[in-house]
Interface confidence: low
């Protein structure tokens, strides 16, 4: 009598997550009497996947009709495969006993699961940074298999090179995660810029997944301040203008001070956007020169996006001014801070 053979023809099978996996097994004889069982893994810790004699295994079905007595095909199909199903599966013939006695095992079939990476999630810095500073963006994607994966960063279509990427875990696993950090140098023109994290994987069939982040969430463009005086009006009133330009985000508070005393406070709202995404704002203050005996020190104080206030001052010389319209006055600039605030006197 020839020796019983348990044949598992495929050494490995690769299946996409969500699909069904067919694990083939045939036996050379139905003798001796006893069940066929499928296990994942070998040794004492192996997991019973299917018992062709009895039991309830909702995701597993027999490939061929096991009710036919001449059936020697004990292949199974596992539905709705997930990465957790990866492993080596063994078709094992038992001789009926108490307990059943293992007779012969197939060589095993390694099931690997091709799982798509999750949509990349890009997160930016917790606080805004100003132009000429470098900020970090992080991209994460999870649950993919096999481990090989490609991740690229782009800023406005140009690939970034200052990138650090890690795939975890380093060893064998049912699925993997990728985390990548890109360092991006901000410029004042980056309000409309975008960074893209692009993930390519064998499961995506050449159509990479993309995650995006807008630099508008990460950048702060501080304003330029310029205070100027218009010509003296006939009613001895001087119109002083504070021009706040090229700032982002819009959150801005402007306060006028006359000789250090608050004259008026305004909040920027519903401003038109410049082409580069920044905003401009102009505020006017009418100063009645005849009401002052001494020079008037006007200060335009701007608080932008919760940052320390930036001042621009202007002195209206009362003693020197003639009554006629168009006469000159002297101006004084003070209080510029370390930011790039450029402003001339009027």
């Amino acid at each position: 009598e020839e020796e019983l053979q348990v044949i598992q023809p495929e050494k490995s099978v690769s299946v996409a997550a969500g699909d069904s996996a067919t694990l083939n097994c045939t036996v050379s004889s139905l003798i001796p009497v006893g069940p066929i069982q499928w296990f994942r893994g070998a040794g004492p810790g192996r997991e019973l996947i299917y018992n062709l004699k009895e039991g309830h295994f909702p995701r597993v079905t027999a490939v061929s009709d096991p009710t036919k007595r001449n059936n020697m095909d004990f292949s199974i199909r596992i539905s709705n495969i997930t990465p957790a199903d990866a492993g080596t599966y063994y078709c094992v013939k038992f001789r009926k006993g108490s307990p059943d006695v293992e007779l012969k095992s197939g060589a095993g079939t390694e099931l690997s699961v091709r799982a798509k990476p999750s949509a990349p999630v890009v997160s930016g810095p917790a606080v805004r940074a100003t132009a000429e500073h470098t900020v970090s963006f992080t991209c994460e994607s999870h649950g993919f298999s096999p481990r090989d994966i490609t991740l690229k960063w782009f800023k406005n279509g140009n690939e970034l090179s200052d990138v650090q990427t890690n795939v975890d875990p380093a060893g064998k696993s049912v699925s993997y995660s990728i985390r990548s950090t890109a360092r991006v140098l901000l410029t004042r023109r980056d309000v409309h810029s975008q960074v893209i994290c692009e993930v390519a994987h064998v499961t995506l069939q050449g159509d990479p997944l993309r995650g995006t982040a807008n630099l508008s969430e990460a950048i702060r463009v501080p304003p330029f301040l310029e205070v100027t005086q218009q010509s003296m009006r006939a009613d001895n009133q001087v119109n002083v203008t504070c021009q706040v330009t090229k700032f982002y985000p819009q959150r801005l508070q402007l306060t006028w001070l006359e000789n250090g005393n608050v004259s008026r406070t305004e909040m920027a709202s519903a401003l038109p956007e410049n082409k580069d995404g920044t905003y401009n704002w102009t505020s006017w203050l009418l100063v009645n020169v005849s009401a002052h005996r001494d020079d008037v020190k006007l200060t335009c104080q701007v608080e932008h996006d919760g940052q320390p206030a930036v001042n621009k001052s202007f002195s209206v010389k009362v003693s020197a001014h003639p009554k006629e319209q168009g006469s000159n006055t002297a101006a004084e600039n003070t209080g510029t801070n370390e930011r790039n605030i450029y402003g001339g006197s009027g």
Epitope: V33, L52, A62, D65, P66, T67, R69
Partner: antibody, heavy 118, light 107 residues
Framework: EVQLVESGGGLVQPGGSLRLSCAAS????????MHWVRQAPGKGLEWVSA???????YYTGSVKGRFTISRENAKNSLYLQMNSLRADDTAVYYC????????????WGQGTMVTVSS | DIQMTQSPSSLSASVGDRVTITCRAS??????LAWFQQKPGKAPKSLIY???SLHSGVPSKFSGSGSGTDFTLTISSLQPEDFATYYC?????????FGQGTKLEIK
């Protein structure tokens, strides 16, 4: 609940015909081998016919050429067309489901009586 | 066809008794043997398949054994509801065949 309900039995003259039906509920009939088993009054069980999941059919020698087993998947029903009936076909006819793995009978219907008499 | 022979044809026993019914096949049927219980006027009930495996819901007082040609059904402790007719059946090849039955009666 998994259930088999037979119908169609009755009194028929020798040489006549009868069609037995078996309505399955709680499972998909086409996924199982299905059988007809009969029992003459006061006698033992006799396997009559089977239909496999692939549509293959089997008969005991005494009914070959006279009985036809079939199923209608859309109605989840099994049938036994009995022609050229004889007195020795008189019996209670049971519809039976074969088990998933080895065709061991697991579910039986309540039976329907067929009487062949003039 | 494979012939199935049961013995005894009838058996008297008392509540609490342990009884054994045997079934012999005319040729090797591996372990493709089933046992059924039938009460008067009722459909048979499946008890055991593949010679020794209990169907769902069947109490463990029923047990089967055997392989090849000789099989047994044992009821460990008879209860009043166990008095019935028992049939064995081979299902290794068509035509499937039954034993003639064993009538278990109360003594």
């Amino acid at each position: 609940e998994v259930q088999l309900v037979e119908s169609g039995g009755g009194l028929v003259q020798p040489g006549g015909s009868l069609r037995l039906s078996c309505a399955a509920s709680g499972f998909t009939l086409s996924s199982y081998d299905m059988h007809w088993v009969r029992q003459a009054p006061g006698k033992g069980l006799e396997w009559v016919s089977a239909i496999g999941t692939a549509g293959d059919t089997y008969y005991t020698g005494s009914v070959k050429g006279r009985f036809t087993i079939s199923r209608e998947n859309a109605k989840n029903s099994l049938y036994l067309q009995m022609n050229s009936l004889r007195a020795d076909d008189t019996a209670v006819y049971y519809c039976v489901r074969g088990g998933v793995w080895d065709d061991a009978f697991d579910i039986w219907g309540q039976g329907t009586m067929v009487t062949v008499s003039s | 066809d494979i012939q199935m022979t049961q013995s005894p044809s009838s058996l008297s026993a008392s509540v609490g008794d342990r009884v054994t019914i045997t079934c012999r096949a005319s040729q090797d049927i591996n372990n493709y043997l089933a046992w059924f219980q039938q009460k008067p006027g009722k459909a048979p009930k499946s008890l055991i398949y593949t010679a020794s495996s209990l169907h769902s819901g069947v109490p463990s007082k029923f047990s089967g054994s055997g392989s090849g040609t000789d099989f047994t059904l044992t009821i460990s402790s008879l209860q009043p509801e166990d008095f019935a007719t028992y049939y064995c059946q081979q299902y290794v090849s068509y035509p499937y065949t039954f034993g003639q039955g064993t009538k278990l009666e109360i003594k």
